[in-house]
Interface confidence: low
């Protein structure tokens, strides 16, 4: 009799997930000399140990602690860029501005970016058919708990001026239910972080509104201020020009507002 397999609402584990994690680890450690000491097989063993044989709705931050330990990495605390619902532009930015870092520029973020994974209780099988959906099934699933764990640690590490890129095209520019809104905002350390500077990215070319006056941005400002952290906000009206000016700051057109 075939063993009954739980059908979840979300997509299954990414094809070739173990191979991808291992390959990404090797690539990352080759590119980043400061992480050359990392043993990628041990990293994979710790990653797998966090969710294999465990019920995919019963994962805890503790399950990921061995992986967190192996992935310990020093990122300049005053060069952290958070983002919400605008990952691609944030990554394009740090690819140009090499001294700034998103979570996905760290080893652990890089390993898991865009991947889905889950296991099954009491077997070491990876479930390639389906994984729990955060809303429809459970929030304590392997992927959600991973990102909550690494995001919390990333925010806790930040200091001085922390930047966050927000998507001005969305109805909720700041969303309290996003990872940024539910985890990172609340784990910035007031004794270390002086200012949170939001960059609101405009979508339309003719959009000249001041999105820093958006009610959700005001809500963010209120949350941050209550935590004794200063808040500032900038409109990025032309993200394409913004990136161009990061690449070539001497360009004469870069003195005007972007």
């Amino acid at each position: 009799v075939p063993r009954w397999r739980q059908q979840w609402s979300g997509p299954g584990t990414t094809k070739r997930f173990p191979e991808t994690v291992l390959a990404r680890c090797v690539k990352y450690t080759e590119i980043h000399p400061e992480m050359r000491h990392v043993d990628c097989q041990s990293v994979w063993d710790a990653f797998k140990g966090a969710f294999i044989s465990k019920h995919p709705c019963n994962i805890t931050e503790e399950d990921y602690q061995p992986l967190m330990k192996l992935g310990t990495q020093t990122v300049p605390c005053n060069k952290i860029l958070l983002w919400s619902r605008i990952k691609d532009l944030a990554h394009q930015f740090t690819q140009v501005q090499r001294d700034m870092f998103t979570l996905e520029d760290t080893l652990l973020g890089y390993l898991a970016d865009d991947l889905t994974w889950c296991g099954e209780f009491n077997t070491s099988k990876i479930n390639y058919q389906s994984c729990p959906d955060w809303r429809k099934d459970c929030s304590n699933n392997p992927v959600s708990v991973f990102w909550k764990t690494v995001s919390r640690r990333f925010a806790e590490a930040a200091c001085d001026v922390v930047h966050v890129m927000l998507n001005g095209s969305r109805s909720k520019i700041f969303d309290k239910n996003s990872t940024f809104g539910s985890v990172e905002v609340h784990n910035l350390q007031p004794e270390k972080v002086q200012t949170l500077e939001a960059w609101v990215i405009h979508g339309g070319r003719e959009d000249s509104r001041d999105l820093c006056q958006d009610p959700t941005i005001k809500e963010l400002e209120s949350i941050i201020s209550k935590r004794n952290i200063q808040f500032s906000c900038k409109n990025i009206y032309r993200p394409d020009k913004f990136l161009q000016c990061v690449k070539n700051p001497e360009d004469s057109s870069c003195t005007s507002e972007i």
Partner: antibody, heavy 119, light 111 residues
Framework: QVQLKESGPGLLLSSETLSLTCTVS????????VSWVRQLPGRGLEWMGR???????DYNSDLKSRLSISRDIAKSQVFLKMSNLKTEDTGTYYC?????????????WGPGTMVTVSS | QFTLTQPKSVSGSLRSTITIPCERS????????VTWYQQHLGRPPLNVIY?????PSEVSDRFSGSIDSSSNSASLTITNLQMDDEADYFC??????????FGGGTKVTVL
């Protein structure tokens, strides 16, 4: 060091049940999967089934109706039972340890045990 | 479930290079890693390549593995062929249920 060793009767009659034991050392059955693989005379290798670290089992669909795999963690032993033997089940039976987890290959094999089924 | 097809035999002269192909019948060869085993007569198989092209540290660097998506095949290449390389070679992969699939095996003869 890692070792696996198969044991069991070498000669059986058709329709009897084969019982083999794989005794392992140097690793734990709660950390590594162990599979049974057989090799029939003049033929290739055939995967029979495995026991997972959690205790669950998987079987080759062609053999499923006749196979049963179990284990005793305390004794570091994995067991294979195959019922309703036929003369064409004659061959060498190996147990093997899964390598890593992600590659599904075997890094350590037992020396094998020869099983002859006569009519 | 797919099958893995190997030639029955491959031969090469001493110190030459031979390649053993292993063709996957359906699905992409890159979907799942391929492993290669060497088996001498009366001995259990020995893992010589895992994860398509990775070689265990104790295996000679004369052995290399590769995959070719155009022919949907994996290959084991042995350079500087030695008498001791005379053995049977099996490719192996796994399907989406992690059931293990072996190729039929290739007998390598050193001339």
């Amino acid at each position: 060091q890692v070792q696996l060793k198969e044991s069991g009767p070498g000669l059986l009659l058709s329709s009897e049940t084969l019982s083999l034991t794989c005794t392992v050392s140097g690793f734990s059955l709660t950390s590594y999967e162990v599979s049974w693989v057989r090799q029939l005379p003049g033929r290739g290798l055939e995967w029979m089934g495995r026991v997972w670290i959690g205790g669950d089992t998987d079987y080759n669909s062609d053999l499923k109706s006749r196979l049963s795999i179990s284990r005793d963690i305390a004794k570091s032993q994995v067991f294979l039972k195959m019922s309703n033997l036929k003369t064409e089940d004659t061959g060498t039976y190996y147990c093997a340890r899964a390598y890593g987890f992600n590659y599904w290959s075997f890094d350590f094999w037992g020396p094998g045990t020869m099983v002859t089924v006569s009519s | 479930q797919f099958t893995l097809t190997q030639p029955k035999s491959v031969s090469g002269s001493l110190r030459s290079t031979i390649t053993i192909p292993c063709e996957r019948s359906s699905g992409d060869i890159g979907d799942n890693y391929v492993t290669w085993y060497q088996q001498h007569l009366g001995r259990p198989p020995l893992n010589v390549i895992y994860a398509d092209d990775q070689r265990p540290s104790e295996v000679s660097d004369r052995f290399s593995g590769s995959i070719d998506s155009s022919s949907n095949s994996a290959s084991l290449t042995i350079t500087n062929l030695q008498m001791d390389d005379e053995a049977d070679y099996f490719c192996q992969s796994y399907d989406s249920n992690t059931d293990i699939i072996f190729g039929g095996g290739t007998k390598v003869t050193v001339l």
